[in-house]
């Protein structure tokens, strides 16, 4: 676990999970619904997601220097995602297998979230928007795009952490 | 098995308040919406609301704001519906029920409205 | 709200009719429409989901059609324990409405 004053996390314990996360991401995302997508949804239906940016230091040079920015935003984005899998948008019609990885996914996300949270302080969590109700209608367009988008952060994510055990870990 | 059982029938007078429960068994509690359906006798089935139990959100038909407020308890795989300032027009069976597209129902509370 | 209208509101049949229900929509709900039974005194149990989906445990003799705002839940041959009523309902969107229910009885 991380611990407050700028230490570093579990690297090794965080690539794990990460890899993890990549897997299951990947794995979920054919299975959000029970038909094709239809042209309903083409307007951009998902709210501004979090992406890993050039500023955020999760380049080799910002996690050497100061990792704790770059651990942030990935923390953040954990968090927006793990509202997001335990929304209805998956929980809601059309049903999920019962045997489906998006419950294990919003689990794996909320485990590296609490991995990375320092003991005894809090980071800043960007606001996390109140999902209104999504319509079951929207459902299948909407998981289509935040599974997308979360294996693209997470992919981002495990590189990161791979990173870090490789050349940070104590 | 999937099993939603709902707590016995009730006698309430007009004005009071009861609460209803659903205790869900075979399944992951949080992995689905629970809903609250109701049957006055004789008539047609009226969607009264729904909660999601791993988010804790609620969704309402508008004409049961005010007249239900509905609950889940992780713990004990547990929703339940407050109905308050009751009526005879609140006579009626009540049921729980998952998504609809898993077809799981709950046997039904009936609630009588009497003075 | 998306109203469901069903068609007739009461069906007398001789056992191994053939038999349609009909359920309209106020608006097009795609195919997000779920047929259910209802016996006298017991729960509703889901027959058909997104219009044509079997469900497990469901006799073959009950079938689903219609996308859009038209839809028919077909039996295609009659027993005496289909008697009950049978309701339409939308899944496509808030508030969530079933039909006013077709009763289905035995002559």
């Known amino acids: 676990r991380a611990v407050p004053g700028g230490s570093s996390p579990a690297w090794t314990q965080c690539q794990q999970l990460s890899q993890k996360l990549c897997t299951l991401a990947w794995s979920a995302h054919p299975l959000v619904g029970h038909m094709d997508l239809r042209e309903e949804g083409d307007e951009e239906t998902t709210n501004d997601v979090p992406h890993i940016q050039c500023g955020d230091g999760c380049d080799p040079q910002g996690l050497r220097d100061n990792s704790q920015f770059c651990l942030q935003r990935i923390h953040q984005g954990l968090i927006f995602y793990e509202k997001l899998l335990g929304s209805d948008i998956f929980t809601g019609e059309p049903s999920l297998l019962p045997d489906s990885p998006v419950g294990q996914l919003h689990a794996s996300l909320l485990g590296l979230s609490q991995l990375l949270q320092p003991e005894g302080h809090h980071w800043e969590t960007q606001q996390i928007p109140s999902l209104s109700p999504s319509q079951p209608w929207q459902r299948l367009l909407l998981r289509f795009k935040i599974l997308r988008s979360l294996q693209a952060f997470v992919a981002v994510a495990a590189r990161v952490f791979a990173h870090g055990a490789a050349t940070l870990s104590p | 098995q999937v099993q939603l059982q709902q707590s016995g029938a009730e006698l309430a007078r007009p004005g009071a308040s009861v609460k209803l429960s659903c205790k869900a068994s075979?399944?992951?509690?949080?992995?689905?919406?629970l809903k609250w359906v109701k049957q006055r006798t004789g008539q047609g089935l009226e969607w009264i609301g729904e909660?999601?139990?791993?988010?804790?959100?609620?969704h309402y038909n508008e004409k049961f704001k005010g007249k239900a407020t509905l609950t889940a308890d992780k713990s004990s795989s547990t929703a339940y519906m407050d109905l308050r300032s009751l009526t005879s027009e609140d006579s009626a069976v009540y049921f729980c029920a998952t998504n609809w597209d898993l077809g799981y129902w709950g046997q039904g509370t009936t609630i009588t409205v009497s003075s | 709200d998306i109203v469901l209208t069903q068609s007739p509101a009461t069906l007398s049949v001789t056992p191994g009719d053939r038999v349609s229900l009909s359920c309209r929509a106020s608006q097009s709900i795609s195919d997000y429409l779920h047929w259910f039974q209802q016996r006298s005194h017991e729960s509703p149990r889901l027959l058909i989901k997104y219009a044509s989906q079997s469900i497990s445990g469901i006799p073959s003799r009950f079938s689903g059609s219609g996308s859009g705002s038209d839809f028919t839940l077909s039996i295609n041959s009659v027993e005496p324990e289909d008697v009950g009523v049978y309701y339409c309902?939308?899944?496509?969107?808030?508030?969530?409405?079933f039909g006013s229910g077709t009763k289905l009885e035995i002559k």
């Open positions: 075979g399944y992951t509690f949080t992995s689905y919406s």
């Open positions: 309902q939308n899944g496509h969107s808030f508030p969530f409405t």
């Open positions: 909660i999601h139990p791993r988010s804790g959100n609620t």
